[in-house]
């Protein structure tokens, strides 16, 4: 996988009036490493790993850059003509990548009320607009405004990409995204019994890199896909990931089942707890992933936040 740096910015308008401030997140190699504190108007580290490795200068620079980007996005939102009453959002996702062969990519994507209307390749300056008439209108609106704005020249796009790549290289050198291996912690829990069946859940947490195999086995043989339910592999905010797999088994057959995990050349099998352990663990069956921080703001405002 290539190394990547991604910024996610959003501005809001209420009844035609663009709200002050903006929302922002930064991801390094898919891991959240930056959040923008709207109250303090500062970029801050997300997770201990970013805090430990990246110095104060990083957050000063990121604050300046995000403030400028946020202002640009707010000005762009003011020029979107079709704003009816109610709450509206304009979101920009900017990504730059360094691939294994040292080639680079850069792009940015714009969403209005959660709908993609414009994608730009920062290296070729090519734009892509979805077929819908709404997207076409929005894209024309925005690009016309940019044409009037001297800053939005080809040189500006090139600088934008160069700046992003420069940061990415600096962060990688700082060791934030060192390709270290952190083996998963695996635990198996059982839910309440219903109709003689038990739901067994196997959770892997705090692992890096992201790729993992997690599957239930019966008598040493993998269960078929349609008898298992998998959770997404999600960042846990500490530079590592978490995921889960669940299946239903007949009560009394616990000994036949193991959770098999394979990660970065290591593997392990984890049995289903039985007897007292089964009862003790039975409460820990929540399969829902709760989003914290910025996402709560978007959810509260019923705004679709594109990852």
């Amino acid at each position: 996988e290539p190394h990547s740096l991604r910024y996610n910015l959003m501005v809001l308008s209420q009844d035609g009036s663009v709200q002050s401030g903006f929302l922002a997140e930064g991801h390094l190699d898919g891991q959240p490493f930056l959040r923008y504190d709207r109250q303090k108007r500062r970029a801050k580290p997300q997770g201990q790993w970013a805090e430990d490795v990246l110095g104060a200068k990083t957050w000063d620079t990121e604050t300046e850059d995000l403030t400028e980007n946020g202002q640009d996005l707010r000005r762009t939102l003011t020029h979107i003509k079709d704003q009816k009453g109610g709450l509206h959002s304009l979101q920009e996702i900017r990504v730059c990548e360094i691939h294994e062969d040292s080639s680079t990519r850069g792009s940015r994507h714009f969403y209005y009320d959660g709908e993609l209307f414009l994608s730009q390749n920062l290296e070729t300056q090519e734009s892509t607009v979805p077929q819908s008439s709404r997207a076409q209108t929005l894209a024309m609106n925005v690009t016309n405004f940019w044409k009037e704005d001297a800053m939005k020249t080809k040189t500006h796009y090139r600088a934008m990409q160069a700046d992003c790549l420069q940061k990415l290289q600096r962060y990688l050198k700082s060791g934030v995204a060192i390709r270290r291996t952190v083996p998963p912690m695996v635990n198996v829990t059982c839910s309440e019994v219903s109709e003689g069946n038990i739901t067994v859940t196997c959770r892997a947490s705090s692992f890096y890199p992201r790729n993992i195999t997690l599957t239930w086995r019966q008598d040493g043989v993998s269960l078929s896909h349609n008898t298992q339910q998998w959770g997404d592999v999600l960042p846990d905010g500490n530079g590592t990931y978490q995921t889960w797999v669940a299946t239903r088994i007949r009560q009394g057959e616990e000994q036949r089942f193991t959770c098999y995990m394979e990660h970065s050349g290591n593997h392990g099998t984890h049995p289903v707890p039985s007897g007292k352990a089964l009862v003790l663990q039975s409460q820990r069956t929540d399969h829902h992933h709760h989003h914290h921080g910025l996402n709560d703001i978007f959810e509260a405002q019923k705004i679709e936040w594109h990852e």
């Epitope: 008598d219 040493g220 043989v221 993998s222 392990g268 049995p271």
Partner: antibody, heavy 118, light 107 residues
Framework: QVQLQQSGPELVKPGASVKVSCKAS????????IYWVKQSHGKSLEWIGY????????VYNQKFKGKATLTVDKSSSTAYMHLNSLTSEDSAVYYC???????????WGQGTLVTVSA | DIQMTQTTSSLSASLGDRVTISCRAS??????LNWYQQKPDGTVKLLIY???RLHSGVPSRFSGSGSGTDYSLTISNLEQEDIATYFC?????????FGSGTKLEIK
């Protein structure tokens, strides 16, 4: 390729015990279960039990509980089956087998003949 | 325990014949049925797993079918090297159980 090499034939006296070994090669030993199967002369196959080499967890056929004990030595990638209090009924060929994670008894050892005779 | 019955203990066929070996379980085994080949020297190989899935390296002349309690193994074009005893085995319920075997001979 996956190979299971079993120990040689054993001639043992009634009441004695025997330990049959099964050395695995060609794959990561702790990834897959080792199963044991008995075949009495001219008869069908009977499943004895299995062991998970990663954590030593065992599951036995009720019929062989107390008769067979399954163990592994991870350092030598070897599985063992210990049979105790032997009688003529225990005279048989014993097979070890492993899985590829998709089917039971995917690969088999060549078998070990155990003869119980006074 | 689930009983696995192979009613035909031995079967004679000519080279090139289509041969079917059947196996019945004493209760529904939900397709968890495997077939093994045991050569006269005692060597055992997996042929078919989960009723009809061909194990890698097994010639395509072998096929499996069935459901519920009734299953069969078919050899579409019998070859000399197929002379062996064939066992069915259920993997649905512990203890795993095998059929008594069907010995295949050449006419």
């Amino acid at each position: 390729q996956v190979q299971l090499q079993q120990s040689g034939p054993e001639l043992v006296k009634p009441g004695a015990s025997v330990k049959v070994s099964c050395k695995a090669s060609g794959y990561a030993f702790t990834k897959y279960n080792i199963y044991w199967v008995k075949q009495s002369h001219g008869k069908s196959l009977e499943w004895i039990g299995y062991i998970d080499p990663y954590n030593g967890g065992t599951v036995y056929n009720q019929k062989f509980k107390g008769k067979a004990t399954l163990t592994v030595d991870k350092s030598s990638s070897t599985a063992y089956m210990h049979l105790n209090s032997l009688t003529s009924e225990d005279s048989a060929v014993y097979y070890c087998a492993t899985t590829d994670g998709y089917s039971l008894f995917t690969y088999w050892g060549q078998g070990t003949l155990v003869t119980v005779s006074a | 325990d689930i009983q696995m019955t192979q009613t035909t203990s031995s079967l004679s066929a000519s080279l090139g014949d289509r041969v079917t070996i059947s196996c019945r379980a004493s209760q529904d085994i939900s397709n968890y049925l495997n077939w093994y080949q045991q050569k006269p020297d005692g060597t055992v190989k997996l042929l078919i797993y989960y009723t009809s899935r061909l194990h890698s390296g097994v010639p395509s002349r072998f096929s499996g079918s069935g459901s519920g309690t009734d299953y069969s193994l078919t050899i579409s074009n019998l070859e000399q090297e197929d002379i062996a005893t064939y066992f069915c085995q259920q993997g649905n319920t512990l203890p795993f159980t095998f059929g008594s075997g069907t010995k295949l001979e050449i006419k």
